[in-house]
């Protein structure tokens, strides 16, 4: 009679994570008598996957009844496959021996490859806010995918970005992989409503890529522009001065009025108006009693925006002149923080 052969007909098997792998094995003879065992890997470090007669293998089931007379089908199913199960599986025939059974013949092996989906990409931005014209970095991470081949793209408001660097780890063979990418984005004043998107495409996703997003509203700080103007007379000895705080983001803003360098009033922006681009405007009024001043008055609108150093704009009020409308001071625009002031 011809010597027993162990046949593993499949050189390779590809299974998606979470599914069941079927590893096929048949023997060509019933002799010698002895059990079949399945191993992952070869040599002394091999891992026992299934022993026909002994041991606990809750994830493994046999395709056929191994105790059936003349059974020569030793195929197994392994349930709930994970990337850690990848490797080459050998069906090995043992012959009964004393004290231990002796390995008789091995199949050629079946390579199990596991396809695992990447995790949802997580996009994170800088820890601190930055102002327009600055370049900020965003990172995108996704884990647990297999095989290693993967494509990552960055978008800002639907426009693909080109300034990014991507790494897939580890470099060598592994049961699963991770991707890490860093993109550089130049901020503009219009970016409050902008989004940065990281898009990951992988063979397991069947053409439906995964996306992670970050809102630039979490990253950007748009400093305000200040304008101080004197309004027409409201009463014989009173002048109304306004400080217009325009185009700022986020809303956190505190405004202080100073008369000749002395604090007159401090207020926090509350009732603001929102611009189409997502930035805010706010206006504060100061009613100045001219008769209380003998000399000219220097009025300063000082704004602290989002915890940044205060910026200010001043207006000179001439008390000698009749309190009629005067032009606005054209001091340089400065950043400030958004808050509403009521006298």
């Amino acid at each position: 009679e011809e010597e027993l052969q162990v046949i593993q007909p499949d050189k390779s098997v590809l299974v998606a994570a979470g599914e069941t792998a079927t590893l096929r094995c048949t023997a060509t003879s019933l002799i010698p008598v002895g059990p079949i065992q399945w191993f992952r890997g070869a040599g002394p470090g091999r891992e026992l996957i299934y022993n026909q007669k002994e041991g606990h293998f809750p994830r493994v089931t046999t395709v056929s009844d191994l105790t059936k007379r003349n059974n020569m089908d030793f195929s197994i199913r392994i349930g709930n496959i994970t990337p850690a199960d990848a490797g080459t599986y050998y069906c090995v025939k043992f012959r009964k021996g004393s004290p231990d059974d002796v390995e008789f013949k091995s199949g050629a092996g079946t390579e199990l490859s596991v396809r695992a989906k990447p995790s949802a990409p997580v996009v994170s931005g800088p820890a601190a806010r930055a102002t327009p014209q600055h370049t900020v970095s965003f990172t995108c991470e996704s884990h647990g995918f297999s095989p290693r081949d993967i494509t990552l793209k960055w978008f800002k408001n639907g426009n693909e970005l080109s300034d990014f660097q991507t790494n897939v780890d580890p470099v060598g063979e592994s049961v699963s992989y991770s991707i890490h990418s860093t993109a550089k984005v130049v901020l503009t004043r219009e970016d409050v409503h902008s989004q940065v998107i990281c898009e990951v495409a992988h063979v397991t996703l069947q053409g439906d890529p995964l996306r992670g997003t970050a809102n630039l509203s979490e990253t950007i700080r748009v400093p305000p522009t200040l304008e101080v103007t004197q309004q027409p007379v409201r009463a014989e000895n009173q002048v109304n001065v306004t400080c217009q705080v325009r185009k700022f983001y986020p809303q956190r803003l505190q405004l202080t009025w100073l008369e000749n360098g002395n604090v007159s009033r401090t207020e926090t922006a509350s009732t603001v108006t929102e611009n189409k681009d997502g930035t805010y405007n706010w206006m504060s009024w100061l009613l100045v009693n001219v008769s209380a001043h003998r000399d000219d008055v220097k009025l300063t609108c000082q704004v602290e925006h989002d915890g940044q150093p205060a910026v200010s704009k001043s207006h000179d009020l001439k008390v000698s002149a009749h309190p009629k409308e005067q032009g606005s001071n054209t001091a340089a625009e400065n950043t400030g923080s958004n808050e509403r002031n009521i006298y």
């Epitope: 091999r46 026992l48 041991g55 606990h56």
Partner: antibody, heavy 113, light 108 residues
């Protein structure tokens, strides 16, 4: 559900023989080896031997070789362990176990004159 | 025969503490063949860990196993009142099958 149900407690005189049964349900007894394990009072677990119910092949621990006989009846899905020439140190609980995950409830054997 | 030596013989700990039980083999045991059991008085052994590190069905995640070659460890991360029992390691890599002498985890 896999279950192994053993026969009841036994009291034997020194020199006698005891035969304990282990009936299985929830699987075919031919599927796995059936092991027998001894546990003397206050002591650890000691493997005695096993049978392959499919063909009756047995292996025994050197300590019990010659005194223990393990058999199986596949028609009733029952395994047996027979221990002869009993002595006082054989007073113990005897367990049957399969696939090293499922154990019988144990059978107490007391050897006393 | 492969002799399995467990240490310590007795471990006195309080609930909530971490328990580390050792099992040393006289010759190398493939990790696939090293199992751990828990046994309480009057009960049959209960499988806790199979193939060195795999949790048997219904066993809480506070139990974990590790090791390779000749040195294996069972860890209980935070002892619960029901964990006070005797623990055995077991090898079925070669004949005769053997068990360690056991470690009794008792309440301090």
């Amino acid at each position: 559900e896999v279950q192994l149900v053993q026969s009841g407690a036994e009291v034997k005189k020194p020199g006698a023989t005891v035969k304990i049964s282990c009936k299985v349900s929830g699987f075919n007894i031919k599927d796995y080896y059936m092991h027998w394990v001894q546990q003397a009072p206050g002591k650890g677990l000691e493997w005695m031997g096993r049978i392959d119910p499919e063909d009756g092949e047995t292996k025994y621990a050197p300590k019990f070789q010659g005194r223990v006989t393990i058999t199986a009846d596949t028609s009733t899905d029952t395994a047996y362990m027979e221990l002869s020439s009993l002595r006082s140190e054989d007073t113990a609980v005897y367990y049957c176990a399969t696939s090293w995950a499922y154990w019988g409830q144990g059978t107490t054997v007391t050897v006393s004159s | 025969e492969i002799v399995l030596t467990q240490s310590p013989a007795t471990l006195s700990l309080s609930p909530g503490e971490r328990a580390t039980l050792s099992c040393s083999a006289s010759s190398s045991v493939s990790s696939s063949y090293l199992y751990w059991y828990q046994q309480k008085p009057g009960q049959a052994p209960r499988l806790l860990i199979y193939s060195t590190s795999n949790l048997a069905s219904g066993i809480p995640a506070r139990f974990s196993g590790s090791g390779s070659g000749t040195d294996f460890t069972l860890t209980i991360s935070s002892l619960e009142p029901e964990d006070f029992a005797v623990y055995y390691c077991h090898q079925w890599s070669s004949y005769p099958r053997t068990f360690g002498g056991g470690t009794k985890v008792e309440i301090k």
